[in-house]
């Protein structure tokens, strides 16, 4: 009864409906379920088609472009979970661009495990208010669900039974609104006592066994149960699974031999991207986690003693690093046997990528080269590189080679990080932001003083664009209020005064004190820091009453700390000496103001003596919030209220609808009725700047989610025929 | 022949601790849970709570939640609820029933009336 | 808590009479309600559970109904073995709550 068909991977179904038969005998889809893309297809060929025995997909179920289709009613009707193991952008179902679904139509589904809903721009797709999603997951603040047809008001969503009169369907409250609930006109959604948690229940509301997940054929019997909360083994759900059994895929027991057979098919397909599994903690999972390494006899994750070796083989001896996406492909190594080049121009949030995937990296068997990687501020990325061996060395003996690089300012903090270089030489040259001083103390720590020849470093391209300090900066008065901080230092003159043009005063918000100049940023502007630019003082010839420089930081968020560091910014000096000086980072946190207004209040009256008041914190809270403080105030009652004939025809009935606080900005636009701006009594007000803020952040927002699903669905043709799922490998 | 068996009687003083057991037989008692309703004298009954035969979870009425404590013996087939901090106001006949889906009560015990007087 | 709210809370009939009697929930319940029927000295025994159904067992004069948060227990003909005290109760949400009970005596 439990799963009665077979547990198929994930799929992807895309240009046409001759794959969608792969589903056929399909309970479990251990995996995502993609359908996208189908431009041909027509209701007809929908019509007969039926996938009753799928009851779980693990990942997500993603639609997108497929018209013809008007509802998955017939296409999955007995669909009851969706776990949301992975999810697509944080979302377990996504309906997108369906241009001729008119109801979603899923009415068994019951449960979504992890992740949200986000249904958008389907311009015929009704039956949506009808649904009632915090019965079917917990995180219903986080749907997106826009630019529908439902949105429009244009949507006569009627619930069975509601034609002749009755109120077949289950009513539940949302933002005070009683609703009937229903998936389409001829089916009600499922709704359990609420004591039946997530469980699901009988049709006479028995709660089913606390093993089940949506629904179940008995109550206490979880044989019973048509999915697990937990797991999955032998037709029954369990909480954990027993030995000799392993969890897998966070749903089901497998025993040995089947983590087993995972592992060999993997390790003698030699196809890549497949996982060798192993067993940990009792499941059975596609690798080791960090800290662990495999015993090839029985899979098992042992402790490594010390970090983990991972050798990775580059091909053809050397691996150009030129994307985030490249940079993946070496993801937990830590010995790269071979060399690596670094070229990379550009990106989103490159530092803490690149450390992601290059930070275990310990040692480099060849050698290291740094080219044209103009978004590069530090190789502080390669947090663990401990160790360029240069068995292969760049043309002209080079273990170490950094070319071109317009922004690099530092190589690593050589004050916490150790290099040992044992054979070729360093190559620096056009990098005009590294000061000498840097490269000399890297000749230093890494042991290849003195094997470098004249030409290796060049003088007159490395530093010479760079401030390149040597003197320290004190702070020497510094005081806060909520929104503006006011700093002074001492003063600094290089040896020609006149070589002072200014200071630049870098700040940002830091809540850990655990800042340093270069980790995280890059070129492209992630993680950067604000820079002020101040004049240099009027100077003394009294250098007792030297005025101190400082600056007034404004608009800044009250109970915010920053981190700030102040430095000089000189003329190049004709000697090749470059003088300056640099403060240390300090850590400055502004005053506590008052909060700004409690956000979406909702007051609902639930008897004749009470209302209840329901308000989310502010979005500013500009301190410790400790308390909040409720005014009320008793109204006269209206006297029209008491002339009124109440048996006069016509009469409407009061509308006591507000709008919701959680809705969409478009639903809330098209809940602002016509006839109001027609009648010209009323025009709407001018946007306030927060509201303008809102909206770009959400058109970001839909921009950024729109990227995402066309980076992930639209992929190149493969030449080969492919066989089956993109990804037959258990996902 | 399904029947729930309840302890005798019980005289307590302001302050003490009561502990009621209630034995199953004629059905397999981790396949459903033991609910837990008192009843004081002239009253309607009141719910205290519910505890799992296949887990021991339990869910107490908030009104109890400090002062009650339920428990299962599998291996005897028996339920037990402990009231502690007895007040005269717990006087009641206090009753287990067996739960079908959660809240189905559909068989019940005798019943233990549970005296607190000074 | 969910209040329930029973009516009458005595109600006086003779057997062959109709006898109707309404529980009213303080929020909605949706179908979630159950009546029981307690005779003195004895437990609770089940009569009707989801408003409607009949537990087994349960004569079909017995029948329950709804109206928004409002429900009744009808006897279409009470019978010398009906008397006693009806309770409704509440599973929509803990905690679980009971009417406080009528009772139906002889007249």
């Known amino acids: 009864h439990l799963y009665p068909g077979e547990v198929c991977p994930g799929m992807d179904i895309r240009n046409n409906l001759t794959r969608l038969h792969e589903l056929e005998n399909c309970s479990v889809i251990e995996g995502h379920l993609q359908i996208l893309l189908m431009f041909k297809t027509r209701p007809e060929d929908f019509r007969d088609l039926s996938f009753p025995k799928l009851i779980m997909i693990t990942d997500y179920l993603l639609l997108f472009r497929v018209y013809g289709l008007e509802s998955l009613k017939d296409l999955f009707p007995n669909l009851t979970v969706i776990r949301g193991s992975r999810l697509f952008f944080n979302y377990a179902l996504v309906i997108f661009e369906m241009v001729h679904l008119k109801e979603l139509g899923l009415y068994n589904l019951m449960n979504i495990t992890r992740g949200s809903v986000r249904i958008e721009k389907n311009n015929e797709l009704c039956y949506l208010a009808t649904i009632d999603w915090s019965r079917i997951l917990d995180s219903v603040e986080d749907n997106y669900i826009v630019l529908n047809k439902d949105d429009n008001e244009e949507c006569g969503d009627i619930c069975p039974g509601t034609a002749k009169g009755k109120t077949n369907c289950p009513a539940t409250v949302i933002n005070g609104q009683f609703v009937e609930r229903c998936w389409t006109h001829s089916h009600c959604q499922k709704v359990c006592p609420t004591i039946c948690k997530s469980h699901g229940c009988t049709a006479e509301g028995l709660c089913c066994h606390s093993e089940c997940l949506g629904n179940c054929s008995q109550p206490d019997d979880p044989t019973k149960c048509v999915a697990c909360r937990n797991f999955y083994l032998d037709g029954r759900c369990v909480e954990t699974c027993p030995p000799p059994y392993y969890h897998f895929q966070d749903w089901r027991c497998v025993n040995f031999s089947f983590c087993q057979d995972l592992h060999h098919k993997c390790k003698n397909s030699r196809r890549q991207g497949c996982h060798q599994y192993v067993i940990h903690n009792n499941k059975c999972i596609p690798e080791c986690p960090s800290g662990y390494t495999m015993n090839s006899s029985n899979l098992l994750c042992t402790p490594c003693l010390g970090p983990c070796p991972k050798v990775c083989h580059l091909l053809e001896g050397e691996k150009t690093i030129d994307s985030v996406t490249s940079a993946q492909e070496l993801r937990g190594c830590t010995v790269i046997n071979g060399s690596l080049i670094i070229n990379i121009r550009g990106g989103n949030n490159l530092a803490a990528e690149l450390e992601a995937n290059l930070g275990l990296i310990e040692e480099i068997s060849g050698y290291l080269k740094i080219r044209r990687s103009y978004a590069l501020v530090s190789l502080s990325f390669f947090r663990k590189l401990r160790l360029i061996r240069g068995e292969t060395l760049e043309i002209g003996n080079y273990s170490f080679y950094a070319l071109d690089n317009q922004n690099l300012r530092q190589l690593w903090d050589w004050s916490k990080h150790n290099l040992t270089i044992t054979q070729g030489k360093l190559f620096f040259h056009y990098n005009p932001k590294l000061c000498l001083s840097e490269i000399h103390k890297m000749e230093e720590v890494s042991g290849t003083k003195g094997r470098q020849e004249r030409n290796d470093i060049a003088l007159k391209t490395n530093g010479d664009q760079a401030s390149c300090e040597n003197e320290l900066l004190k702070f020497s008065y510094i005081r806060t209020s909520f929104d503006k901080i006011l700093l002074r230092w001492e003063p600094y003159w290089p040896p020609d005064f006149r070589d002072l043009l200014g200071f630049m005063l870098f700040y940002k918000e830091a809540p850990y004190q655990n800042v340093t100049e270069f980790d995280g940023q890059d070129a492209c502007g992630s993680n950067s820091w604000t820079v002020v630019d101040i004049d240099p003082p009027l100077r003394s010839n009294d250098p007792k009453s030297q005025n101190h420089p400082g600056w007034l930081m404004r608009g800044l968020k009250p109970w915010t700390q920053y981190a700030i560091f102040v430095k000089t910014l000189v003329t190049f000096s004709d000697e090749r000496r470059t003088y300056g000086a640099k403060s240390d980072i300090i850590y400055v946190q502004t005053d506590a103001t008052n909060p700004s207004v409690p956000l979406d209040p909702i007051s609902v009256s639930n008897s004749s003596s009470q209302i209840i008041l329901k308000w989310k914190p502010p979005s500013d809270p500009n301190g410790n919030i400790t308390h909040y403080l409720v005014f009320w105030e008793r109204q006269a009652e209206d006297s029209e209220l008491f002339e009124l004939d109440y048996c006069l025809k016509g009469l409407k009935l009061p509308s006591r609808t507000w709008s919701p606080p959680f809705e969409s900005e478009d639903s809330q636009k098209h809940n602002q009725s016509e006839y109001e701006d027609s009648a010209g009594e009323c025009c709407s007000c001018p946007k306030t700047d927060s509201q303008i803020l809102k909206e770009l952040e959400e058109s970001s927002f839909r921009k950024t989610f729109e990227d995402y699903l066309h980076n992930v669905v639209f992929v190149p043709r493969k030449t080969s025929s492919g066989t089956g799922a993109e990804d037959p490998r258990p996902s | 022949q399904m029947q729930l068996v309840q302890s005798g009687a019980e005289m307590k003083k302001p302050g003490a601790s009561v502990k009621v057991s209630c034995k199953a037989s004629g059905y397999s008692f981790s396949d459903y849970g033991i609910t837990w309703v008192r009843q004081a004298p002239g009253q309607g009954p009141e719910w205290m709570g519910w505890i799992s035969g296949y887990n021991g979870n339990t869910n107490y009425a908030q009104k109890f939640q400090d002062r009650v404590t339920m428990t299962t013996d599998t291996s005897t087939s028996t339920a037990y609820m402990e009231l502690r901090s007895l007040k005269s106001d717990d006087t009641a006949v206090y009753f287990c029933?067996?739960?079908?889906?959660?809240?189905?009560?559909?068989?019940w015990g005798q019943g233990t009336l549970v005296t607190v007087s000074s | 808590a969910i209040r329930m709210t029973q009516s009458p809370s005595t109600l006086s009939a003779s057997v062959g009479d109709r006898v109707t009697i309404t529980c009213r929930a303080s929020?909605?319940?949706?179908?979630?309600l159950a009546w029981y029927q307690q005779k003195p000295g004895k437990a609770p025994k089940l009569l009707i559970y989801t408003t409607s159904t009949l537990e087994s067992g349960v004569p079909s004069r017995f029948s329950g109904s709804r109206s928004g948060t409002e429900f009744t227990l009808t006897i279409s003909s009470l019978q010398p073995d009906d008397f006693a005290t009806y309770y409704c109760q509440q599973y929509n949400s803990y905690p679980l709550t009971f009417g406080g009970g009528t009772k139906v005596e002889i007249k």
């Open positions: 929020q909605s319940i949706s179908t979630w």
């Open positions: 029933a067996r739960a079908r889906g959660v809240w189905m009560f559909d068989n």
